[in-house]
Interface confidence: medium
C-alpha cells in the first residue's frame, strides 16, 4: 500500500524537515531557514514563531519544530500554551487594568500573579485567629477558644507561626 | 489601561491607496506585536499580517502580500497599514489588535474602508 | 493554512439554556481562541489557549478539546449572550479563523 500511495504521490516520500517542491519536479526540499514542517508529505514549511518582546525563546526552531516561547523576568506566562504573558505584581498585589495594586484589608496574595483572596474566616471552622493576614499572607487559624478555656481536654499548643526556611528563635 | 485608537473611515476611489493608523497607549508599544484583521460586511475575520514595531519584523498571511504593508512609528507609538491598488474587494472594516503570540483581548474600534468610484 | 470549521453556522436559545458550539481544524492545532463579536463593536476575547477565561469573561463560558475538535460551551444562555463566535488558531501563520457561529436569543 504504501509503494502504491508513494507511486501516486511522490510528495508522501517527504520526510518531516522537507517539502515536495512542485517548482522542482516534485523534489524533497530542506525547509528553507526560519521555518519547519513536522510532518511528511508537506507542500509548504511553516513559517517559525518569533519569540520577541514580553517573549523569550524557550526551544529554539528547528527544521522538524516549531519554536517555543516563555516569558522574560518581570512576567508570567498566562495559559499553557504561553501564547500572553502578564506583568508581575509584588506579593501582596495585583494585577489592574491600571497596573498592581496593593491587596484591599481583609484580602491577600502570596503569589506575583493572580488575585488577592479574601483571608480565610476561621470562625467558620468554629477556630480562632492564631496569627492575623496580611497582604502578603493568609490568617492561621488556630485550635477553637473553648479548646483553650480552663477545665477542656489538654491540648497541646501548636508552635509559633514562622517562615519557612527560618530557624526558631 | 491599553487602548487602541484607529483613524476614521475612508471613502476611496478604485486603484487608489489609504494608509490607516491605530495608535497605541496604556503599554510599552515597542514590545508588543501589532496585527490587522479585516472583516467584510456580514463576513467573518480575516488576519492579514503582523509587526513587531521593536526592529520592524512582519509577516504576512500570502493572501494579503503586495495588497497590505505593515509599518509602525516608535515615537508616536503608531501602527500603520497601507492598502494599495483598492477595488471593492477591499472595502471592510479593518481592524488592529495587540498581539503576543495570539491576539491578546486588546483591539481598535475599526476602520470603515469604502471603495467606490 | 489550517483551515477552521465551525458549526453550527447559526443556532438559537432560550435563556438558561446549555450551548455548545465546535470548532473542527483541517490539521492538529494545540491552541484555540474564542472570541465574541456583536454587530458594530469590535471582537472580545473569551477564551484563550483553549480553555482559560480571558479577564472580566462570566464563568458561564468555558473551553474545550483539543487535536482537531474543540469547543465553546455556554452553560446557562443569557441574553446578552446573542452575538456571532469565532474560534481563532495562533499556532501556525498564518493565524486563521473559523467562519463563525451566529447565536440567537429564542
Known amino acids: 500500500f504504501e509503494r502504491t500511495r508513494s507511486l501516486q504521490d511522490p510528495c508522501s516520500n517527504c520526510p518531516a524537515g522537507t517539502f515536495c517542491d512542485n517548482n522542482r519536479n516534485q523534489i524533497c526540499s530542506p525547509c528553507p531557514p526560519n521555518s519547519f514542517s513536522s510532518a511528511g508529505g508537506q507542500r509548504t514549511c511553516d513559517i517559525c514563531r518569533q519569540c520577541k518582546g514580553v517573549f523569550r525563546t524557550r526551544k529554539e526552531c528547528s527544521s522538524t519544530s516549531n519554536a517555543e516561547c516563555d516569558c522574560t523576568p518581570g512576567f508570567h506566562c498566562l495559559g499553557a500554551g504561553c501564547s500572553m504573558c502578564e506583568q508581575d505584581c509584588k506579593q501582596g498585589q495585583e494585577l489592574t487594568k491600571k497596573g498592581c495594586k496593593d491587596c484591599c484589608f481583609g484580602t491577600f496574595n502570596d503569589q506575583k500573579r493572580g488575585i488577592c483572596r479574601p483571608w480565610t474566616n476561621c470562625s467558620l471552622d468554629g477556630k480562632s485567629v492564631l496569627v492575623n493576614g496580611t497582604k502578603e499572607r493568609d490568617v492561621v487559624c488556630g485550635p477553637s477558644p473553648a479548646d483553650l478555656s480552663p477545665g477542656a481536654s489538654s491540648v497541646t499548643p501548636p508552635a509559633p507561626a514562622r517562615e519557612p526556611g527560618h530557624s526558631p528563635q | 489601561q491599553v487602548q487602541l485608537q484607529q483613524s476614521g473611515a475612508e471613502l476611496v476611489r478604485p486603484g487608489s491607496s489609504v494608509k490607516i493608523s491605530c495608535k497605541a497607549s496604556?503599554?510599552?508599544?515597542?514590545?508588543?506585536?501589532m496585527n490587522w484583521v479585516k472583516q467584510r460586511p456580514g463576513q467573518g475575520l480575516e488576519w492579514i499580517g503582523q509587526?513587531?514595531?521593536?526592529?520592524?519584523?512582519?509577516n504576512y498571511n500570502g493572501k494579503f502580500k503586495g495588497k497590505a504593508t505593515l509599518t509602525a512609528d516608535k515615537s508616536s507609538s503608531t501602527a500603520y497599514m497601507q492598502l494599495s491598488s483598492l477595488t471593492s474587494e477591499d472595502s471592510a472594516v479593518y481592524f488592529c489588535?495587540?498581539?503576543?503570540?495570539?491576539?491578546?483581548?486588546?483591539w481598535g474600534q475599526g476602520t470603515t474602508l469604502t471603495v467606490s468610484s | 493554512q489550517i483551515v477552521l470549521t465551525q458549526s453550527p453556522t447559526i443556532m438559537s436559545a432560550s435563556p438558561g439554556e446549555k450551548v455548545t458550539m465546535t470548532c473542527s481544524a483541517s490539521?492538529?492545532?494545540?491552541?484555540i481562541y474564542w472570541y465574541q463579536q456583536k454587530p458594530g463593536s469590535s471582537p472580545r476575547l473569551l477564551i484563550y489557549?483553549?480553555?482559560n477565561l480571558a479577564s472580566g469573561v462570566p464563568v458561564r463560558f468555558s473551553g474545550s478539546g483539543s487535536g482537531t475538535s474543540y469547543s465553546l460551551t455556554i452553560s446557562r444562555m443569557e441574553a446578552e449572550d446573542a452575538a456571532t463566535y469565532y474560534c481563532?488558531?495562533?499556532?501556525?501563520?498564518?493565524?486563521?479563523f473559523g467562519g463563525g457561529t451566529k447565536l440567537e436569543i429564542k
Open positions: 489588535a495587540r498581539g503576543q503570540l495570539g491576539l491578546d483581548g486588546y
Open positions: 496604556g503599554y510599552a508599544f515597542s514590545i508588543y506585536w
Open positions: 509587526i513587531y514595531p521593536g526592529d520592524g519584523y512582519t
Open positions: 490539521s492538529s492545532v494545540s491552541y
Open positions: 489557549d483553549t480553555s
Open positions: 481563532q488558531q495562533w499556532n501556525i501563520y498564518p493565524y486563521t
